[in-house]
Every structure is written in C-alpha cells, then in structure tokens.
C-alpha cells in the first residue's frame, strides 16, 4: 500500500544489467519538496540489498557521493549471478521511533554474454514430418537470452524462428513446422543459431546438411508374417513402409533368446523371405528402414511382431530305457521309460507316443499309444523281444527308436568293475568305473541309472538314467539329485544282446544320521543272540548309511562297551552275536554311520542270555 517511487528515483550506472565481476553505482535521489518535513538537512538515504526477498546487507558504508538531504550514490561490487534487488530508504534521524520510509528500488541482473551455440543437430521424423533442430547453448547466462534458428536452403528461401531462455525455461530446440520433401534430396541446407542478450551476442558455426542427412524414416508398421504351406521354418515377413525407403534391417529372435538374427534387405518393398526359422517357436520380429543405401539414418525399430511358428513333424531320437521284473515262471513285466524330446526336436506339442513291443522270432507284436513317458506290459519270458517308441505331434511322428530287451544284469562277464560314487557338490555325484574284464562281446554303450533309496521308490518313481558312449568311464549325475539322500546307482554295460551291471550307493552330501536303529527284539537261538531292528526312517538317514554298530555292556558296568560293526544292507534287519556270558544282564543299543559320522544311539534293550555262550 506504499506508493513506491513517489518520494524519489533510483538509477544504475552503467546499466541495470552488468557482467559478472563488474561494479555498479546506484544513485538514490529525492524528488523536490520530499524528505524529512522539519529538518531537510537531517535527511539520510540508506540502500538495502535483498537476495530472494531476504535482506542481506545495509550498504551504508558504500557511499561514494552524498548531497546531504538530496541524493546519495553507492558503489556495489561482488554481485553474484542472477537478480539482486536494491531498495533506497529515507531515514529521518530526528524521529527515532519512525522506521525508514521506502523511496524507490532497482533490480540489477548479473550474467554473462552467450557462448556460441554448438552441436546443432536437425531431424525430420518421417517423409511427412517437420524439421526440428536442437543445439547446445553452452554456459547458463543468468539473463533472458534470445535464440534465433535460421535455416537457408533452395529457392532462395530462409526460414527462421525464435525462442528464449531465462530462469524459468530453457531454449535449446525448435521445430520449424516445415516439411522437407524427397524432391529436395540433392539440395543443401545451412542452419545456424544466433544467441543474443543484454551483454552481447554470438553465432554458431554454420552447419550444412542434406535431406538424406536429417530425414529419419518412420518405423515400419503393420508387420505380419505368412508361413508358406504352414511351414514351421519358412515364412514371408511383410510390412508397410514410407515410399522412399530403399533399405531395411530385419531382426528376429526366439523370445527366450539374448541375441538377434540380423538381415539387411535392399529394395525389399515391404516383403522378405525367411528360411531358417525354428518350428513351434515363439519369435519376435522387428524392422528398421533407411532412405539411402550409404547415407542417412536408420528409423527406430518397429513395434515387435510376436508370433509362434507352425509345428513340423518331430525329429531326433527318443532316449529309451526299461526295467524287467519276473512275475512267475513264464511271465515277465516290462516297463518302458523314455525322456521327452527337447523343444527343437519335438517341433510342436507332442500329442502321444506310439509304443511297440515285438517278439523277434514269432513276430508277435503289441502296439499302443500313450500320452505318458512310460508304458508297462506283461509278456512271456521266452523269446527275444525288442521295443520301439516314436513321438507324434499334429504334423507327424518321429522315426521310431529301437531297443533290444535283454537281461540287464544277466551276464557277469559284462559287469563293469571298480564302480565308485563321489559327491562333487550339493547336487551332483561323479560315478566312475572300469570296463568289464572278460566281456565276450563288445560293449555298445553304458547306462548309468539311479533312484532314491526310499520306500516304494521302485514302484512310485521312474528311474533316471544317462547314456554313456563305450569309450567313456565316468558320468556326472545331477538330474533330481538332492543333498542328504542316498541313491542306488547302477552302471549297466550293454552289448547287442546281453547286459551286465554293477551297483553302488552314493550321495551328494551327507550328515550323521539323526537317530540310531530301533532294536525290536533280542532272541536266543542255538547259543547265539539274534538282534532284530527296524531301519532308520528315510528322512533321518541323511545320506548313505555305511554300516550299523551294535553295542553291549554289562548292565551296571562302567567299562567301555563292546561293539560289532555290520556292513549296511537294506534287506538285512537282524544279526547274530555270540560273545555274551550266560545269566549276565546286558544293555544293548545300535547306531548308524554315514561318511559324515555316527548317529546318536537308538533305544536301549536289556537282555540276559540263558544258554551257554561261546
């Protein structure tokens, strides 16, 4: 509500806009008949400095000139970049109670002259787009700075447009709104940017370009693919492009891939044949365009086309294995197992498997289809049998895989020697062996088969197996291997018509068992004691049990117990001991040992042998 500048004026020399580091003189003058009413000579003019509306300094000591009661000149130095407000006030010294009265004020701007704009770059997006240029303005000037973009070209024409930068907005890009058309392909354009503010002006170096240098085609659109005769490996990719495009780049990859297949296509006219696609595979396709073979810029990549190639008939060989179990004197159960084809072999969704069991001499054939990866049949024990399996999808079936059904462990001379199983790390086991010593027929391949030694595993879970060439003597097994579980591992050596095998137990990691075996009964037979027990529950074994220990001592004795160590066999659950005295009461217990150590003891049982002990 104060009428500012009614009392006087404030002026700045050399100007209200000054370069950084310069000084300025600010003069504050009272208008005639203004000032302190009673004592004009007591007029005191003071100058206050404000930055961001905050009083930062009273410039009382910076007076360089004083007409008492009429005007004062102050010198200001070391002004920081940006805007500083100075307010002149009148202080009537005879009246201490009244605050100084504002006379007038001035804003001084400190900045720098603009640097020449650099790195001018112009772009037109698409044949129907408009020319937009951007540049680097250089250092901030802290002043309102006007920029003029000037584009000169054919037909004696110059186009120009302006914008400005200040503390609220930055100007480093302008769209001229004008379109350069292909008829100007050979023409040259010159662009320059001029910057001007109150402290000076500067111009960029002229930048020359042609239509081809700056026009970036729009990315192709409406991308589609047509698979020839529903082929899964050949397709024609089609798209729409701007009319002047002469070069395209195509990239495509399966969706789970990390590297693109790249193709350059000249004068494709929106069409290109691809011949190396993988059937039944999700692909991503993208296309980019260019207006000139050597010059110009590539468009952005198009939006992705995602599609799955059609199926083709499966290729590859199924990996088959089997188990034989005699049911009675003239019948056996054959269980066939096979591994799923990998996607590149299946080339589609496998709908079913065709399984055939054939007796070679009598020409008996059992055929069936199944959607599972196993098949079980009861067949006569006589005759030579062969099995074959093929996989079928909507386009056809794979070539059948044949396997001769032989007695897998029937020939001792074919049994591999020195089979060992070493834990490599948490989830695999290294199995090694030596070839059969006196095989009377050549080993065609080895099969390493494994399954967890848990109750019902033979019936509940299919086996895992690896096929190993005959010149290899080791296998690293990792499929379905878990720590702290014991696996039965068999190494089969197969010839054309015979099989031999050796068995071992192994684990990938072990701990001492959680508990010892539970003694269920102690019986006396023919001057020997038979200790019977139940095995440690499967989850508590924590690896392969190497042996059991039976401990005993006289009931109240403090002596060390005696012990008997038994090699672990899964089928065994009793063992005789014969070194106990008759009519002495003993305490007995058992422990189990893995490669990691011994379990705590199982339950204790007391027993007093009656008969004569040896």
């Amino acid at each position: 509500n104060i009428d500012v500048c009614k009392l006087g004026t404030v002026t700045v020399q050399p100007a209200p806009v000054i370069p950084l580091g310069s000084a300025a003189n600010i003069s504050c003058s009272l208008n005639p008949k203004q000032g302190c009413s009673h004592y004009p000579s007591s007029n005191e003019l003071i100058l206050l400095k404000f930055v961001n509306d905050v009083l930062v300094e009273n410039l009382h000591g910076k007076k360089v000139h004083d007409h008492t009661g009429h005007s004062s000149t102050f010198q200001v130095t070391n002004l920081s970049l940006g805007m500083t407000l100075f307010v002149c006030k009148l202080n009537c010294s005879n009246s201490q109670k009244k605050p100084p009265v504002p006379v007038c004020g001035v804003e001084i701007s400190v900045g720098v002259a603009p640097e020449p704009p650099q790195n001018i770059s112009c772009v037109q997006e698409g044949e129907n787009g408009t020319v937009a240029c951007s540049w680097n303005s250089g250092k901030v000037t802290y002043l309102k700075t006007n920029y003029t973009l000037q584009l000169s070209g054919p037909n004696n024409l110059t186009c120009q447009k302006q914008c400005f930068s200040d503390n609220r907005q930055n100007c480093n890009r302008l769209d001229l709104g004008i379109n350069l058309s292909p008829d100007l392909a050979e023409s040259r354009f010159i662009v320059r940017v001029t910057a001007i503010n109150d402290l000076g002006n500067s111009s960029s170096l002229p930048h020359t370009f042609t239509f081809l240098d700056i026009v970036i085609p729009l990315p192709p659109w409406d991308i589609r693919i047509n698979f020839l005769n529903a082929s899964g490996s050949r397709g024609t990719l089609q798209w729409e492009d701007e009319g002047q495009v002469v070069l395209n780049q195509l990239r495509y990859q399966p969706l789970n891939s990390t590297s693109w297949n790249m193709v350059n296509a000249t004068n494709a006219k929106g069409k290109y044949d691809l011949r190396d696609l993988r059937p039944f595979t999700e692909y991503e396709f993208q296309i980019s365009s260019k207006l000139h073979l050597s010059g110009g810029s590539w468009s952005n990549w198009s939006e992705s086309l995602r599609t799955r190639t059609p199926e083709e008939e499966p290729v590859g060989i199924l990996d088959i294995w089997y188990m034989k179990q005699d049911i009675d004197y003239d019948r056996q159960q054959i269980s066939l197992f096979w591994k799923s084809l990998n996607p590149s072999e299946a080339r589609g969704k496998i709908l079913h498997y065709q399984v055939t069991l054939q007796e070679v001499t009598k020409k008996t054939t059992l055929q069936n289809t199944t959607r599972h990866t196993s098949w079980t049949r009861v067949i006569p024990r006589t005759g030579a049998w062969t099995a074959s399996v093929s996989a079928a999808n909507s386009k056809g079936a794979s070539a059948p895989t044949h396997i001769n059904i032989v007695d897998l462990c029937g020939t001792g001379l074919l049994a591999p020697h020195q089979v060992s199983a070493k834990s490599e790390n948490m989830d695999n086991i290294l199995v090694t062996w030596q070839p059969p010593k006196k095989a009377d027929s050549a080993v065609r391949e080895y099969i390493v088969e494994w399954r967890a030694l848990q109750p019902g595993s033979i019936t509940k879970f299919p086996p895992h197996w690896l096929r190993i060439p005959p010149d290899n003597m080791s296998a690293l097994i990792s499929e379905n291997i878990k720590p702290y579980i014991c696996y039965e591992i068999r190494v089969h050596a197969l010839s054309e018509s015979q099989g031999g095998c050796s068995s071992i137990r192994g684990d990938s990691k072990h701990k001492a068992p959680v508990s010892g075996p539970h003694i269920t009964a102690i019986t006396e037979k023919k001057e020997r004691l038979f200790i019977s027990w139940t095995h440690i529950p499967f989850p508590e074994q924590r690896g392969c049990i190497l042996h059991y220990r039976i401990y005993w001592k006289e009931r109240d004795s403090t002596a060390q117990p005696e012990l008997c160590e038994i090699q672990y066999r899964r089928s065994q659950n009793s063992h005789p001991i014969s070194s106990l005295q008759p009519r002495v009461t003993y305490v007995l217990w058992m422990t189990a040992v893995t490669a990691a150590g011994e379990s705590p003891q199982g339950n204790e049982r007391e027993f007093c042998p009656q008969g004569k002990a040896n």
Epitope: N128, T130, G153, P154, N155, N156, L157, C159, Q160, K161, Q162, D175, L176, G177, I178, N179, L180, S181, D183, L184
Partner: nanobody, 127 residues
Framework: QVQLQESGGGLVQAGGSLRLSCAAS????????MGWFRQAPGKEREFVAA????????FYTDSVKGRFSISGDGAKNTVYLQMNSLKAEDTAVYYC????????????????????WGQGTQVTVSS
C-alpha cells in the same frame, strides 16, 4: 471462404520504411501460411515473405532478408510486413496470400500453392 484485404502501401523514398497489413476474414488461419508476394511491371510474381501461424516460423526470400520482417496478430487475424531500408527495386504491387497445409519447403515460395489472394497494394520507392 477466406477474404484477404491488404493496406499500407504508398510512395516512399529509398531508405525509408513502410508497414503493410493484411486482414483475413471468413475463417481462422491457425493452420495456414500467410505470405506476401510482389509483382513489378513486366515481371513474374515473386515470393517475399511468409508466416506459418501454428509454428511461428518466418520465411524470407534472400533479397529482403534482414530488411523486411513479417509478424502476425492472431487476435486480429492480421499479418504485417515491416519493410525497412527500401530500395527502388522493391517497387511492385504487394499481394497477400494464404495457403492450407501441408507446408513443404518446396511449396512455400511458389504462388500456385496459395489458395487465397488479396487484391494487392502498390508500393513505390523513389530514388
């Protein structure tokens, strides 16, 4: 339909200044290019300057660059041509013209691409 009306022409000494105005009526010119052409006796009509309303871009022929300045007042639907440092060879009838999109470099300076024309105003520069 767009009507264009020029004014501001007259006789001026070499080195002097004139300001031509072109008022448009009939519809807004927000997407148009408004241009000035001139035709001297016995010569073809030639492009002088143009203003692209939507982009705010100005176009000049080389012979007037730096001397003439085109501007517009959207509220009044009027385009102005400020002519300074006039020369005898600037003597001509000055026509205001307007064109609809698209706006191509190849078309800006060519009279056949302009759909609407004014009657013209005479500018004479005496030496």
């Amino acid at each position: 339909q767009v009507q264009l009306q020029e004014s501001g022409g007259g006789l001026v000494q070499a080195g002097g200044s004139l300001r031509l105005s072109c008022a448009a009526s009939g519809r807004t010119l927000s997407n148009s290019v408004m241009g000035w052409f001139r035709q001297a006796p016995g010569k073809e009509r030639e492009f002088v300057a143009a203003l692209m309303w939507s982009a705010g871009s100005e176009f000049y022929t080389d012979s007037v660059k730096g001397r003439f300045s085109i501007s517009g007042d959207g509220a009044k639907n009027t385009v102005y041509l400020q002519m300074n440092s006039l020369k005898a060879e600037d003597t001509a009838v000055y026509y205001c013209a307007a064109k609809n999109p698209p706006h191509r470099w190849s078309d800006i300076g060519k009279s056949p691409h302009y759909e609407y024309w004014g009657q013209g105003t005479q500018v004479t520069v005496s030496s």
